[in-house]
Interface confidence: low
């Protein structure tokens, strides 16, 4: 009772291979790497058949079908392209993931190339079966920032897209006395986070308590150029308002805060994040030049006291910017502590401006980023936040602007943005 000789399937083999198969002999059909046994529409690794008493095989020889990894998964902020003709998704086919350049880049700098494996999964040499992550590119505006700025105060109009991280923060707080509406600036750190000064988001009560404004009272505008025309801007409400826990209203120490946006903003030519500095306590070196932008007061002939007393809002319609040098801590400390009034320039602050005055940040610019170009990484970095200045006219002689030293807070920012309290788990490029 011999069974007929078996022909192995294409791309497969039969074991054991014998000249003659008799009753009760069994053979195992398996396929080459990258192929699977196909039997009755079912896919399996191997298939066993037996020689029966009547000299027939228990089943027909199955076919070997090439492994198909199927359509690759979509990538958030990225796209997938097929390297193999006819968009094949079968064994050894290749695909390439890439991020939406120039606004996103791939984490870990992987090639993004995935191959359809014998197991039926798209696999990358480094990431294995995990998909790559597209992170926002920070500190690289699509329009190159200028090297020189002539004589904010002594500033000039910014062209659209020069400061794509710049945010306008509008606060309407019913608990504020006497005014219930004010504004400041901020800087986009990722699709969902805005960096700003704590004093911009502190509920302005009569006493010195530090209470954040209610998130319902905060609106953030991104991609804004002219405040008279908000049509092209992205506006977002706040999901969380986080002031530094040790912000001191008396001396503005730890003047730093975060706003988590209600939903991530789409990045583009006019909306891109700024980079955070390395966590170093030195902060920016004296004489380094930085840029600051804002919609604050640009009239150099008005004093801060006059503005506050009159309650007027002489803000600039078009975003202004100015280039300022960092001033040594000792010089700044001396310039303030020699004045009447209780000024304290702490290690969490640095100063910028010109001894002769003429260029400065002013009321309404608060919370905006003081950015410096980092030659090593070729990115713009938020080294400071507009914090405070003396009571004289903005841009007065030997009255430097005081900025929060962001490098002292990188770990706190990181902790807050990645904390379980955050509305959703977000990765922030560091």
């Amino acid at each position: 009772n011999e069974c007929p000789k078996l022909q192995p399937p294409v791309y497969g083999k039969i074991e054991p291979s014998q000249a003659v198969y008799s009753f009760k002999d069994q053979v195992l059909v398996s396929c080459d790497t990258g192929y699977k046994v196909l039997k009755d529409n079912g896919v399996m690794d191997t298939f066993q058949i037996e020689c029966l008493k009547d000299g027939a095989w228990s089943n027909k020889i199955p076919t070997c079908k090439i492994v198909d990894c199927g359509a690759p998964a979509g990538l958030k902020h990225g796209l997938v392209t097929f390297s193999t003709r006819n968009n094949l998704t079968t064994y050894k086919s290749e695909i390439r993931y890439s991020c939406q350049q120039p606004y996103y880049k791939m984490l870990h700098n992987t090639t993004g190339v995935y191959t359809c494996s014998a197991h039926g999964t798209w696999t990358n040499e480094v990431l294995k079966r995990s998909l790559p992550t597209c992170l926002p590119v920070c500190g690289q505006p699509s329009r190159a920032l200028p090297n020189l700025v002539k004589r904010i105060i002594g500033g000039r109009n910014a062209e659209l897209g020069l400061f794509p991280w710049q945010a306008l923060i509008v606060v309407e707080d019913t608990s504020r006395v006497p005014n219930d509406k004010w504004f400041g600036s901020g800087a986009l750190l990722s699709e969902s986070w805005i960096l700003t000064a704590a004093h911009v988001l502190r509920s302005q009560r009569r006493d010195n308590t530090v209470i954040p404004v209610s998130k319902e009272h905060v609106t953030v505008y991104l991609g804004l150029h002219d405040v008279r025309d908000k049509s092209g801007a992205v506006n977002s409400s706040a999901a969380r308002v986080i002031l530094h826990p040790d912000f001191n209203i008396q001396n503005y120490n730890h003047d730093i805060a975060l706003v988590q946006l209600q939903k991530p903003v789409p990045l583009g030519a006019h909306v891109m994040p700024i980079c955070l500095p390395r966590p170093e306590p030195e902060g920016p070196a004296p004489h380094m030049l930085g840029l600051v932008a804002g919609w604050g007061i640009s009239n150099p002939n008005v004093t801060v006291d006059e503005i506050i007393l009159s309650g007027t809002r002489t803000l600039s319609d078009v975003l202004q910017y100015v280039k300022l040098p960092v001033v040594s801590h000792a010089e700044c400390k001396a310039s303030y502590e020699s004045r009447s009034g209780n000024y304290s320039v702490t290690e969490n602050m640095f100063c910028a401006g010109y001894y002769e005055g003429g260029k400065d940040t002013c009321l309404g610019d608060s919370g905006g980023a003081f950015v410096i170009f980092d030659e090593m990484s070729q990115h713009w970095v938020a080294q400071g936040l507009v914090s405070w200045g003396g009571p004289e006219e903005c841009g007065s002689k030997q009255v430097y602007g005081v900025y929060t030293k962001v490098s002292n807070y990188v770990d706190w920012l990181w902790e807050e943005m990645n904390s379980p309290r955050a509305v959703r788990d977000l990765q922030v490029e560091r």
Partner: antibody, heavy 120, light 107 residues
Framework: QVQLKQSGAELVRPGASVKLSCKAS????????INWVKQRPGQGLEWIAR????????YYNEKFKGKATLTAEKSSSTAYMQLSSLTSEDSAVYFC?????????????WGQGTLVTVSS | DIVMTQSQKFMSTSVGDRVSVTCKAS??????VAWYQQKPGQSPKALIY???YRYSGVPDRFTGSGSGTDFTLTISNVQSEDLADYFC?????????FGAGTKLELK
């Protein structure tokens, strides 16, 4: 230069309390967190809590809540940690440590440590 | 709490050798790891912060690397004064946690 000088060794009875001190010099005391760290003989380090002397704000490791109480005296630039209801498990060297800079919770400056021995 | 695991309690080395002390975090801690050296009867001394930044005054034979969950402190050209306990610490989440330590000793 920055210095943290801790109080001397303590021998205390079980159930009693002890108050350790850490006197800071060479920097603005109110501008930096002071942390307390426990090290049992031949063992690793355990973070207990931190205090921000500028505001008195404290943050405790859940494990040490009710055991340790942190305070700070601005006038003398001194931080204190009181340990209560002592048991043999509390026998350890306790270090005070200051952050390198304000927000970063790793420690560039350490006190010399205070040995606490709980024994009857 | 985040657990920092230093799997090697002891490591033997010789003067002039290169040695790597490893530390594994139970969850992603980004780059927020510091390394300390402690000699008997002394308080710990900071060596590395933010995973790879050398603290001022630390000899350049000490280097740190890693991000996420796996971190390494490498001492190239080991000197006799490097024989000590080495601890890693994460500061991505409170409570701050330390590894149990790795003792570096002479072969």
């Amino acid at each position: 230069q920055v210095q943290l000088k801790q109080s001397g060794a303590e021998l205390v009875r079980p159930g009693a309390s002890v108050k350790l001190s850490c006197k800071a010099s060479g920097y603005t005391f109110t501008d930096y967190y002071i942390n307390w760290v426990k090290q049992r003989p031949g063992q690793g380090l355990e973070w207990i809590a931190r205090i921000y002397p500028g505001s008195g704000n404290t943050y405790y490791n859940e494990k040490f809540k009710g055991k340790a109480t942190l305070t700070a005296e601005k006038s003398s630039s001194t931080a204190y940690m009181q340990l209560s209801s002592l048991t043999s498990e509390d026998s350890a060297v306790y270090f005070c440590a200051r952050n390198y800079y304000i927000s970063s919770p790793w420690f560039a400056y350490w006190g010399q440590g205070t040995l606490v021995t709980v024994s009857s | 709490d985040i657990v920092m695991t230093q799997s090697q309690k002891f490591m033997s080395t010789s003067v002039g050798d290169r040695v790597s002390v490893t530390c594994k975090a139970s969850q992603n801690v980004g780059p927020n790891v510091a390394w300390y050296q402690q000699k008997p009867g002394q308080s710990p001394k900071a060596l590395i912060y933010s995973a790879s930044y050398r603290y001022s005054g630390v000899p350049d034979r000490f280097t740190g690397s890693g991000s996420g969950t796996d971190f390494t402190l490498t001492i190239s050209n080991v000197q006799s004064e490097d024989l000590a306990d080495y601890f890693c610490q994460q500061y991505n989440r409170y409570p701050l946690t330390f590894g149990a330590g790795t003792k570096l000793e002479l072969k």
